[in-house]
């Protein structure tokens, strides 16, 4: 089998450690690329034949043109990451009470704040910030890289040679931790959403606290809840049509537990998209309400779908399941007048849906224009 | 689950051609490499070939270059194998199978070459 | 081409006992920094193959702990500590790190 995702997450382990580089130590960065380059050379007996091979080989080749690095070079070593105590550091490995977030985080605080962080449709992405963005990010892209998990998306395009793109692939990498969880990895792909582990199990593995991560399958093959209670967090994934959705509800302090914030500029939960894969869905939102849908596909940042909605019946078909007139109904119209895929209705819908049950500020479930990443804000 | 169903054999004589079918489901059969093999009756395995996610390239055993090609139709999800100038040392049980280096197989289907 | 060969072709092993199948290269499977893909193979009969052992000593998903792989270069061993009457069929080595691939031509495995 192809062991790509080890290269994946050995130079998400370069790049984000307590010694990694920092964004603009260019050399250690060039250095991390290109252990990664070799590493991925290594499996591609394995793995040449696969997409996430040859969307490994081309991230690398942007990122390495992206800061100037040559091929030729020292080449970093993988660091395994010492993990934080997720309570007090005076508690016993192995008591029950450091396998449950909120209640080893009482310990030491009042009440943990949560953030949400989601991503659906064509896609968007609503950051830990509550930012909203549209984003190409095809491809292989972190999502989340912290010192208990990672989660990688890929990305693919909705339709041939188009800039808009829908996530067909999940990885969460659950890292071991304490005497709670042995690591664990989840992988769901477009119709294979299963409610195990990669490995077949159903939660953290052998130790003594395995019961505070725990997979449920809420309805076969569309929608997988995960609990990871030893961080205090809840994953949502769900399959929409086609594509996946992903949504999380994680306490700051999981959020924050990063070694070196200045090499986080990849995760997208964190920072958001880079500025260069952005679309800026609103202005073509106005534009395709302002022109009709006949001058839609000068304004789209995708070819026109073989059968796309015209203007007038895209919003009807959002105004159905999103009476709210926020984000969620704007990149719920955009995304039926990019892709004529009415799945995607009920993407931004269960999305929202998502946020009313991991969001804990009940006043921040619609966002609205004027929380927009407006441009330059990275 | 993994699910991998080949069809398309029976018998043909010399020199005839058969086109075999893999209909894959249960994974995202267009982000995967798929490989054919062949198993003679009461013998070993033999690698036939690979091809890649989007067909951008395809690798043969010496033994079936030039009368044998590969090609998927990702929208199908289905995994095709030609085979031309049959021989009668092609007689074999047919599998396809997942991945760069195959990981899930099918049930195979059997192919006869005989006069 | 590489070739694989196994020894033993045929072998008889008791309920409960261990059992050890070797696969000798013609040349090495070593393709970069110790990556060697080298992988085994179990077909029960009637049966299609099944992936045991991948990249000589990973057990794939849902294969037991009692079967385990070893080797390197162009020596392999793949061992059963302990036989059930499930594991009959034929065990193959293969080789992926030079085109083309190829396997072993077989070990059948029956109980005594």
């Known amino acids: 089998p192809c062991k790509i995702l080890k290269c994946n997450s050995e130079f998400w382990s370069a790049t984000s450690g307590s010694h990694a580089p920092a964004s603009d130590d260019t050399p250690e960065f060039c250095a991390a690329l290109r252990s990664y380059a070799l590493c991925t050379r290594r499996t591609a007996r394995t793995c040449r034949g696969d997409l996430a091979y040859h969307s490994a080989v081309h991230g690398i080749e942007d990122l390495m043109s992206q800061h100037n690095c040559s091929k030729d070079g020292p080449t970093s070593q993988p660091r395994l990451r010492t993990l934080p105590p997720a309570g007090d550091s005076q508690e016993r490995s192995d008591s029950p009470e450091i396998c449950h977030y909120e209640k080893s985080f009482h310990k030491h605080s009042a009440t943990p704040n949560y953030t949400h962080c989601g991503l659906f449709g064509d896609p968007h992405l609503r950051t830990f910030t509550d930012r909203f963005q549209t984003c190409k990010v095809q491809g292989a892209w972190p999502l989340i890289d912290n010192n208990y998990l990672n989660v990688q998306v890929t990305n693919t395009p909705v339709l041939p040679g188009s800039a808009a793109t829908a996530t067909s692939k999940l990885t969460i990498i659950f890292k071991n931790f304490q005497e709670c969880v042995d690591q664990k990895v989840y992988q769901a792909e477009m119709d294979e959403l299963p409610a195990a582990f990669v490995d077949g199990s159903k939660n953290g593995g052998d130790k003594h606290g395995a019961n505070s991560l725990k997979i449920t399958e809420k309805v076969s093959g569309q929608h997988v809840e995960i609990q990871a209670k030893y961080i205090g967090t809840t994953i949502v994934v769900r399959q929409v049509g086609r594509y996946l959705t992903f949504a999380v509800r994680m306490p700051e302090e999981v959020v924050n537990a990063v070694e070196d914030w200045d090499s986080q500029g990849l995760y997208l939960c964190l920072r958001g998209c880079p500025l260069n894969q952005q679309i800026d869905f609103q202005a073509f939102h106005t534009n395709a309400e302002g022109t009709g849908a006949r001058r839609l596909a000068a304004a789209s940042p995708a070819p026109t779908a073989p059968e796309t909605f015209p203007y007038e019946t895209a919003v009807a078909k959002c105004k159905e399941k999103l009476p709210v007139e926020d984000l969620y109904y704007q990149a719920c119209v955009f995304d039926l007048l990019t892709t004529g895929d009415v799945n995607f209705t009920l993407a931004a819908y269960y999305a929202l849906e998502d946020v009313k049950m991991l969001h804990s500020n009940k006043d921040k479930l619609h966002l609205y224009e004027r929380t927009r990443d407006l441009p330059g804000r990275a | 689950e993994v699910q991998l169903v080949e069809s398309g054999g029976g018998l043909v004589q010399p020199g005839g051609s058969l086109r075999l079918s893999c209909a894959a489901s249960g994974f995202t059969f267009s982000n995967y490499g798929m490989n054919w093999i062949r198993q003679a009756p009461g013998k070993g395995l033999e690698w036939i070939g690979m091809i890649y996610y989007d067909s951008s390239e395809k690798h043969y055993a010496d033994s079936v270059k030039g009368r044998f090609t590969i090609s998927r139709d990702n929208s199908k999800n289905t995994l095709y194998l030609q085979m031309n100038s049959l021989r009668a040392e092609d007689t074999a049980v047919y599998y396809c199978?997942?991945?760069?280096?195959?990981?899930?197989w099918g049930q195979g289907t059997m192919v006869t070459v005989s006069s | 081409d590489v070739v694989l060969t196994q020894s033993p072709l045929s072998l008889p092993v008791t309920l409960g006992q261990p059992a050890s199948i070797s696969c000798r290269s013609s040349?090495?499977?070593?393709?970069?920094?110790?990556?060697?893909?080298l992988e085994w193979f179990q077909q029960r009969p009637g049966q299609s193959p099944r992936l045991l052992i991948y990249e000589v000593s990973n057990r794939f998903s849902g294969v037991p702990d009692r079967f385990s792989g070893s080797g390197s270069g162009t020596d392999f061993t793949l061992k059963i500590s302990r036989v059930e009457a499930e594991d009959v069929g034929v065990y193959y080595c293969?080789?992926?790190?030079?085109?083309?691939?190829?396997f072993g031509q077989g070990t059948k495995l029956e109980i005594k």
């Open positions: 293969f080789q992926a790190t030079h085109d083309p691939l190829t």
């Open positions: 040349q090495s499977l070593e393709y970069s920094d110790g990556y060697t893909f």
């Open positions: 199978a997942k991945g760069t280096t195959p990981d899930y």
